[in-house]
Amino acid sequence: IPVIEPSVPELVVKPGATVTLRCVGNGSVEWDGPPSPHWTLYSDGSSSILSTNNATFQNTGTYRCTEPGDPLGGSAAIHLYVKDPARPWNVLAQEVVVFEDQDALLPCLLTDPVLEAGVSLVRVRGRPLMRHTNYSFSPWHGFTIHRAKFIQSQDYQCSALMGGRKVMSISIRLKVQKVIPGPPALTLVPAELVRIRGEAAQIVCSASSVDVNFDVFLQHNNTKLAIPQQSDFHNNRYQKVLTLNLDQVDFQHAGNYSCVASNVQGKHSTSMFFRVVESAYLNLSSEQNLIQEVTVGEGLNLKVMVEAYPGLQGFNWTYLGPFSDHQPEPKLANATTKDTYRHTFTLSLPRLKPSEAGRYSFLARNPGGWRALTFELTLRYPPEVSVIWTFINGSGTLLCAASGYPQPNVTWLQCSGHTDRCDEAQVLQVWDDPYPEVLSQEPFHKVTVQSLLTVETLEHNQTYECRAHNSVGSGSWAFIPISAGAHTHPPDEFLFTP
């Protein structure tokens, strides 16, 4: 650690005195202190001499000697008072700049330690300090306003009592800056804009920050626009607003608009797109397939995306048949607006009944006309099966009718014994009917197919089963010949009821 001579913590001298401060260290040493005049510095290896032969009140301050090469960063200090009866204060700063909630040191150094008892801090022109100003004083350093607030940005003077009267220092301006958390907050409205050529449009770019020092501008396709700025202050924030008013838009006004704001913390920007169109438009689309298939009893949401300008004047969902004249319940239709020009309309169809298959149309209207988008909804059903014994062209025939959607395929099984359903162990014979005859196939209805199995003689201790299946499920019917005639068995679990 360097050593200062004279080896006292404080030195009190009169104006005009010669002062010599010597610092000795192991290596080279350096002096630091208040910015003050009339000192001469002379370094000689490991010692450095600071001297003045005409000390003034401005030399009052703490002089510190450091050894740059010392890894521990040791230093020694001496405080010099130049006791001037006419100048009780040496003010080291014209202005003090701190951030909110930092301590603000107002560097009024007392030139005579005896005066410490009668010091006070005031605002200029003798005004008292603001309420809740918490401060302390050190004769070596000055007044510290603790946890300074923005509102305490004022001009201050240090006051000392000399011979019964108050002597003021020159003023110190305190600037308490708001802590700027980041670049200014931005809004650009609207987020998107569409206008027909000749209409009026307005784009508003606004930025706000806790600090007034920020810039904001609006640019169109990378060209900065010259727009008068409106400034405001509310909710403890500074606001700057740029409003672009276009009385009659044309195609050259279209394009990308960016609102850009910057401060010392950085830059924020946000963009929007302005479309200029020749005339009104209305486009309907769906991400879904317009042909829908759903299993009976399940639910379905039909969604339509609408892109329109100007806004819609009307819209509705309509059921176009074929089963009934019922219309979708309004409570099952809802609309959500994605943004100004795009909307999604949803029709919810829960627990679909057979009578609800068919065509659903969404209709919308705006000044550009009306448009419709139609969905076709077909219900899927598991097969229903029935078997009868009949004679066709004199031959005994088992006739199986299967009804479902999608079209069922049919398999015949012959098995030993009397049973409701053939199991693998009992099966004697299997016939697949790849091309059953289609009896009915209307849109939105079940498909009914018929399969014939010609049987010369019915074996009495056997069961004939017709099985039908599709992507939804399967159904079967067991036919058991008995002496008194034929006997049929639908399986226990049948029938399906939606």
Epitope: T40, L50, V97
Partner: antibody, heavy 118, light 110 residues
Framework: QVQLQESGPGLVKPSETLSLTCTVS????????WSWIRQSAGKGLEWIGH???????NYNPSLKSRVTMSVDTSKNQFSLKLSSVTAADTAVYYC????????????WGQGTLVTVSS | QSVLTQPPSASGTPGQRVTISCSGS????????VNWYQQLPGTAPKLLIY???QRPSGVPDRFSGSKSGTSASLAISGLQSEDEADYYC???????????FGGGTKLTVL
């Protein structure tokens, strides 16, 4: 070894505010005075002002009404704001460490040219 | 117009001794110490002399400074081609309450 680096826009419009930041590396910003000095073809080297790490500032009287300096010890940075600029403020701006008592500048940034033009 | 006055140019041949003067007033050089800076082309100024005649480490002893009254001078002995630069004097000014600079002297090594 202490190093200083100026940063900020190279072009400022007349009447706007010039803002520069100096980042100190290789040493602590604490317990020193930090200065801004500018050099223009017409006026040579001109001291703008200095700031101590406590926030104490002194400015050149000719610029005092337009200057604000601040320091952020947590970032090892100090900054300069010069408002209402004119073409006369076009210069190379340097930040430097100021040694007080006998005032001299022992470390300098490389300088940044700021042009004031519309 | 700079507060401290320097000749705009000076020159010398390699090996020669060159002196650059700096003139001020009682409020600056007359009552405070003088510093000298060297500015090589395209670079920032570099401290050459502080407190009238003190050399920072790394500065060759060919450079020396002196002060008398309200004037100061920088002497460069054994001139070398790499000494071609602009040289500025500076001093604290009591009336300004801050440092002032000279207008600079362009040294050419012939």
């Amino acid at each position: 070894q202490v190093q200083l680096q100026e940063s900020g826009p190279g072009l400022v419009k007349p009447s706007e505010t010039l803002s520069l930041t100096c980042t100190v590396s290789g040493g602590s910003i604490s317990s020193y005075y930090w200065s801004w000095i500018r050099q223009s073809a017409g006026k040579g080297l001109e001291w703008i002002g200095h700031i101590y790490t406590s926030g104490s500032t002194n400015y050149n009287p000719s610029l005092k009404s337009r200057v604000t300096m601040s320091v952020d010890t947590s970032k090892n940075q100090f900054s300069l704001k010069l408002s209402s600029v004119t073409a006369a403020d076009t210069a190379v701006y340097y930040c430097a460490r100021e040694r007080t008592v006998v005032t001299y500048f022992d470390y300098w940034g490389q300088g940044t040219l700021v042009t004031v033009s519309s | 117009q700079s507060v401290l006055t320097q000749p705009p140019s000076a020159s010398g041949t390699p090996g020669q001794r060159v002196t650059i003067s700096c003139s001020g007033s009682s409020s600056n050089i007359g009552s405070n110490t003088v510093n000298w800076y060297q500015q090589l082309p395209g670079t920032a100024p570099k401290l050459l002399i502080y407190s009238n005649n003190q050399r920072p480490s790394g500065v060759p002893d060919r450079f020396s400074g002196s002060k008398s009254g309200t004037s100061a001078s920088l002497a460069i002995s054994g001139l070398q081609s790499e000494d071609e630069a602009d040289y500025y004097c500076a001093a604290w000014d009591d009336s300004l309450n801050g440092p002032v600079f000279g207008g600079g002297t362009k040294l050419t090594v012939l």
